[in-house]
Interface confidence: medium
């Protein structure tokens, strides 16, 4: 008979002869021959394979590095690979999430409007009238003015976006 | 000057306790979130914990969450670290750090000079 000179799914061609692919998961120790089926042995622990593959050795499962600041989200098997994420407070600096930074945070003036999350940034907002932010922080918003009126006290310092009013009593009407 | 001082470490059994402290000065320390970090023998620097100007926010690394507890008192100037169920793997320096507007894990604004924790039976 003619040598094949394609084969079926799952299957390569090799030496005019069709062998059977290696699971995911496994890897290729021999090519098939007129005798004997393709021969496998499964990846070795942190070790993966997610095809159908005549690959003769397996990936390496990815390192989640914590001095990145990376974390595993997802354990890796043999037929995945790891999946790293962020640790809180961090957030990736690519799609592939291959290191992480620490939210960035809003000066004086400014408060947070989103806190940040894995994959995104902290949002700053400039405080608004009436709200001040003394701080440099990636996790607080603007806050209020203290309101004077309703500890019985008067304004004796005006508030800016950075900072409160100051409050101070009344003065006495004299007779 | 930013001076930080980091205070508490030293030798303990596996699953004891430690308090870290670490007072600030030359700086509003009110005005910024802190950093706590360590680094193991032989390691890179791990980030630790986050918390936030006023408190209100804190975060932790997966390998200390629910026996790490980070805290601060703003009257005192001061950060704390509470550590419970101490394992062999947090042996290592730890450092309080000025939390900067941007940076990786070698590069906060300002460190302490850390002080030293081992857990061993």
């Known amino acids: 008979p003619e040598p094949p000179t394609a084969c079926r799914e799952k299957q390569y061609l090799i030496n005019s002869q069709c062998c059977s692919l290696c699971q995911p998961g496994q890897k290729l120790v021999s090519d098939c021959t007129e005798f004997t089926e393709t021969e496998c042995l499964p990846c070795g622990e942190s070790e993966f394979l997610d095809t159908w593959n005549r690959e003769t050795h397996c990936h390496q499962h990815k390192y989640c590095d914590p001095n990145l600041g990376l974390r595993v989200q997802q354990k890796g098997t043999s037929e995945t690979d790891t999946i790293c994420t962020c640790e809180e407070g961090w957030h990736c600096t690519s799609e592939a999430c291959e290191s992480c930074v620490l939210h960035r945070s809003c000066s004086p003036g400014f408060g947070v409007k989103q806190i940040a999350t894995g994959v995104s940034d902290t949002i700053c907002e400039p405080c608004p009238v009436g709200f001040f932010s003394n701080v440099s922080s990636a996790f607080e918003k603007c806050h209020p003015w203290t309101s004077c009126e309703t500890k019985d006290l008067v304004v004796q310092q005006a508030g800016t976006n950075k900072t409160d009013v100051v409050c101070g009593p009344q003065d006495r009407l004299r007779a | 000057e930013v001076q930080l001082l980091e205070s508490g470490g030293g030798l303990v059994q596996p699953g004891g306790s430690l308090r870290l402290s670490c007072a600030a000065s030359?700086?509003?320390?009110?005005?910024?979130?802190m950093q706590w970090v360590r680094q193991a023998p032989g390691k890179g620097l791990e980030w630790v914990s986050t918390i936030s100007a006023s408190g209100v926010f804190t975060y932790y690394a997966d390998s200390v969450k629910g026996r790490f507890t980070t805290s601060r008192d703003n009257s005192k100037n001061t950060l704390y670290l509470q550590m419970n169920s101490l394992r062999a793997e947090d042996t290592a320096v730890y450092y309080c750090?000025?939390?900067?507007?941007?940076?990786?894990?070698?590069?906060?604004?300002?460190w302490g000079q850390g002080t030293l924790v081992t857990v061993s039976s």
């Open positions: 750090a000025k939390y900067p507007n941007r940076f990786a894990l070698n590069n906060f604004d300002y």
């Open positions: 030359g700086f509003t320390f009110s005005g910024y979130d």
